[in-house]
């Protein structure tokens, strides 16, 4: 999916008002210095591509983020403010229902959510030069 035509300001507002808080809740009890940010993004569409991938694609050691509150809200924001995104999710949603897993917070998941926090912060500062 190409995130170029999303309403970035509305997605940013949703992040600031609610998604960010859910990410913090998920990470509660973890030191902010515990994980190094290894995933980066260069512009808003690229950031959303990386955010979508890290949030919804199962990875080794962390297969359960999609059912977290921040993930549900991310999915809603993309479906509402990214033209045509919801259509791409119809088959994906049906497939996800079949492979629903119980929520388990592993260290790998905490690291992944830490990366997500970094991607979202970068999404909110699109004019900053990539370091």
């Amino acid at each position: 999916y190409d995130f170029t035509n999303c309403d970035f300001e509305k997605i940013k507002a949703a992040y600031l008002s609610t998604i960010s808080k859910d990410l913090i809740t998920y990470m509660s009890g973890t030191k902010s210095t515990e994980f190094n940010n290894t995933v980066s993004c260069s512009n808003r569409p690229h950031c959303l591509t990386e955010i979508q991938s890290l949030t919804f694609n199962p990875t080794a050691g962390c297969a359960s983020l999609a059912k977290e509150m921040f993930a549900m809200k991310t999915k809603a924001a993309l479906a509402i403010w990214c033209p045509g995104y919801s259509e791409t999710q119809i088959n994906a949603t049906q497939a996800m229902k079949k492979r629903r897993k119980r929520k388990v917070t592993t260290n790998k998941c905490l690291e992944q959510v830490s990366q997500l926090q970094g991607l979202w912060r970068r999404f909110n500062r699109p004019l900053l030069k990539q370091q």
Epitope: D7, A14, M72, K75, A76, A77, A79, G84, S86, E87
Partner: antibody
């Protein structure tokens, strides 16, 4: 079963406001956005805007921006649409309709409609 | 905003006949089109979503097709309860818009 029950008919004077309610039951309120659609007598359907309980935010058709306010009370699973500065052209049936925001993504259940008549 | 134009405005057919309703979008909207049926004094009822996805409880004589800008709702054999107004709607981007409507009436 899923039900959206709207408030009763209203007769209003030009320049006044109207607030229509839509009480939802039979599903998890925060899993769905609540859209508002109006239909003038003998005319087609016009999307006014939506409230997304999961994100606590609303979005509007620019044609109604500033005049329409869409809100919800999550504790009672009730959505509201307030339209101000009413004029005769606002005489219409107003519908609420739910739409999944993490699945389905379509207006699959509608309220029965609320007739608002604007007349001096 | 995305404009949806439905044709014909009115379709006069007899029970048992096939009805073909068209919806054309002013720009590419992939398959983000849904079809509704509305009878006098009633709220719209969802028939087909995302161009061709069927809804449980809707008779299988209703089917949808199309993508991009051109979409079609087909009623294979009209029953007496099918005479109504049909609307297409796009959810590709805000503001959501509805088509102008096609009235299917008894010939």
């Amino acid at each position: 079963q899923v039900q959206l029950v709207q408030s009763g008919p209203e007769v209003k004077k030009p320049g006044s406001s109207v607030k229509v309610s839509c009480k939802a039951s039979g599903y998890i309120f925060t899993d769905y956005a609540m859209h508002w659609v109006r239909q003038r007598p003998g005319q087609g359907l016009e999307w006014m805007g939506t409230f997304i309980p999961l994100l606590d935010t609303s979005d509007y058709n620019q044609n109604f921006k500033g005049r329409a306010t869409i809100t919800a009370d999550k504790s009672t699973s009730t959505a509201y649409m307030e339209l101000s500065s009413l004029r005769s052209e606002d005489t219409a049936v107003y519908y609420c309709a739910r739409m999944g925001v993490t699945h389905s993504y379509v207006m699959d259940a509608w309220g029965q409609g609320t007739l608002v008549t604007v007349s001096s | 905003e995305i404009v949806l134009t439905q044709s014909p405005g009115t379709l006069s057919l007899s029970p048992g006949e096939r009805a073909t309703l068209s919806c054309r979008a002013s720009q590419h909207i992939s398959r983000s089109v849904h079809w509704y049926q509305q009878k006098p004094g009633e709220a719209p009822r969802l028939l087909i979503y995302f161009a061709s996805q069927s809804i449980s409880g809707i008779p299988d004589r209703f089917s949808g097709s199309g993508s991009g800008t051109d979409f079609t709702l087909t009623i294979s054999r009209l029953e007496s309860e099918d005479f109504a107004v049909y609307y297409c709607q796009q959810s590709y981007s805000f503001p959501y818009t509805f088509g102008t409507g096609t009235k299917v009436e008894i010939k």
